[in-house]
Interface confidence: medium
């Protein structure tokens, strides 16, 4: 006869491990007992359990409540046992020793491998600001056994670096993602992808990038100066900028206070019917926590009466 077992039994932490040991004997042969022992190198054999044809299953005190026979129906030649709720410390070599009659004893070894799935964590780097050089965007750490694989999934251009720390029964892998911050990266996802044989599917943790910036400010509304004449209604100036965080707007007049009747509505300055009083230099001040910008324009309210009396001299230079 001969013993049938597996070279390696792989189980995920917390699952039950079936340690197979089946005696394929000739007709008339009987199995008297099957002894299971842990036989790690450098240490003596430690009995795990003994299945006896007459006395039943005996379990070592160290494994009390954790070793069982597989559920019925059972073959009397099957010496397999179940190791409940596998822990990392169970990883190692096991020996099955079968005593048969009349053929004698047979033994076989297997290795139990306990996979410890990682629980990844993602840590964002320092605040990202446009104008910085290469900066840490995020780091992702996962510890498991065997060592997990940590990669990044993103449309953002950047560089990665990984390092690994080995512990007695596991390994921790940390991967860092560095980039040169730009406003185009705002709102872009940066996803840490962790792969491991103990996971049914990759674990993904997504971080949304926030890059602080403030665009140059500009003022719209003066494109056609001829529209800015006495009596015109609905004239307005609009301050254009964008930023992260969203900026706030403030309007002032450089050559004095804002004229009465002028309404400030965020980025927009609204004028009552225009008078010459409204001529002047207006400043839009844009700011967020990252920076501030100014843009100024000169408003010159035209008096149509004056313009019609003026003559235009054309001077040609040759």
């Amino acid at each position: 006869g001969e013993l049938e077992t597996s070279d390696v039994v792989t189980v995920v932490l917390g699952q039950d491990a079936k340690l197979p040991c089946f005696y394929r004997g000739d007709s008339g042969e009987q199995v008297g007992q099957v002894a299971w022992a842990r036989v790690d190198a450098g240490e003596g054999a430690q009995e795990l359990a003994l299945l006896h044809s007459k006395y039943g299953l005996h379990v070592s005190p160290a494994y009390e409540g954790r070793v069982e026979q597989p559920p019925p129906p059972r073959n009397p030649l099957d010496g397999s046992v179940l190791l409940r709720n596998a822990v990392q410390a169970d990883e190692g070599e096991y020996e099955c020793r079968v005593s048969t009659f009349p053929a004698g004893s047979f033994q076989a070894r297997l290795r139990l491998r306990v996979l410890v799935p990682p629980l990844p964590s993602l840590n964002p780097g320092p605040a990202l600001e446009e104008g910085q050089g290469l900066t840490l965007a995020a780091s992702c750490t996962a510890e498991g056994s065997p060592a997990p694989s940590v990669t990044w999934d993103t449309e953002v251009k950047g560089t990665t670096s990984s390092r690994s720390f080995k512990h007695s029964r596991s390994a921790a892998v940390t991967s860092e993602f560095h980039l040169v911050p730009s406003r185009s990266m705002n709102g872009q996802p940066l996803t840490c992808v962790v792969s491991h044989p103990g996971l049914l599917q990759d674990q993904r943790i997504t971080h949304i990038l926030h890059v602080s910036f403030l665009a140059e400010a500009s003022v719209r509304g003066l494109e056609d100066q001829n529209l800015w004449h006495i009596g015109r209604e609905g004239a307005m100036l609009k301050c254009l900028s964008e930023g992260q965080p969203p900026p706030s707007y403030n309007w002032t007049r450089l050559d004095g206070p804002l004229p009465s009747g002028v309404r400030v509505d965020g980025d927009t300055l609204g004028f009552p019917p225009l008078t010459t009083e409204h001529s002047g230099i207006y400043v839009c001040h844009v700011s967020n926590e990252f920076s501030s910008r100014d843009s100024q324009v000169t408003v010159d309210v035209l008096d149509p009466q004056e313009d019609s009396g003026k003559q235009v001299d054309l001077v040609s230079a040759s």
């Epitope: 008297g32 007992q33 003994l50 005996h58 379990v59 005190p61 009659f101 009349p102 004698g104």
Partner: nanobody
Framework: EVQLVESGGGLVQPGGSLRLSCAAS????????MGWYRQAPGKQREYVAT???????NYADSVRGRFTISRDNAENTVYLQMDSLRAEDTAVYYC????????????WGRGTQVTVSS
């Protein structure tokens, strides 16, 4: 040949405790399984508990949680600690040992009387 000699039996009140010993005439480490059976008057011999040379144990459901089997391979002795004894535990307790070679050879002691009565 292996001689097994039991001791420790006696009369005890319900709820009391006794400790039985069984000394073997040869190294118990070569004795693969040692254990205890019992036989009450007019009944068949009944399995109580067994222990392997490596210390793995098994118990009959009727005694699990009340009796504890242990062995000292250096002293060639197996013990049965009996707690929370009941009247139905009254019986002659026999020590058994099995040697595995080409086939199982089982040895028996002569028994020790345990009586649980008030």
């Amino acid at each position: 040949e292996v001689q097994l000699v039991e001791s420790g039996g006696g009369l005890v009140q319900p709820g009391g405790s006794l400790r039985l010993s069984c000394a073997a005439s040869r190294s118990t480490f070569s004795l693969n399984i040692m254990g205890w059976y019992r036989q009450a008057p007019g009944k068949q011999r009944e399995y109580v508990a067994t222990i392997t040379s490596g210390g793995s144990t098994n118990y009959a459901d009727s005694v699990r949680g009340r009796f504890t089997i242990s062995r000292d391979n250096a002293e060639n002795t197996v013990y049965l600690q009996m707690d929370s004894l009941r009247a139905e535990d009254t019986a002659v307790y026999y020590c058994t040992a099995e040697l595995v070679r080409r086939g199982p050879t089982t040895y028996w002691g002569r028994g020790t009387q345990v009586t649980v009565s008030s």
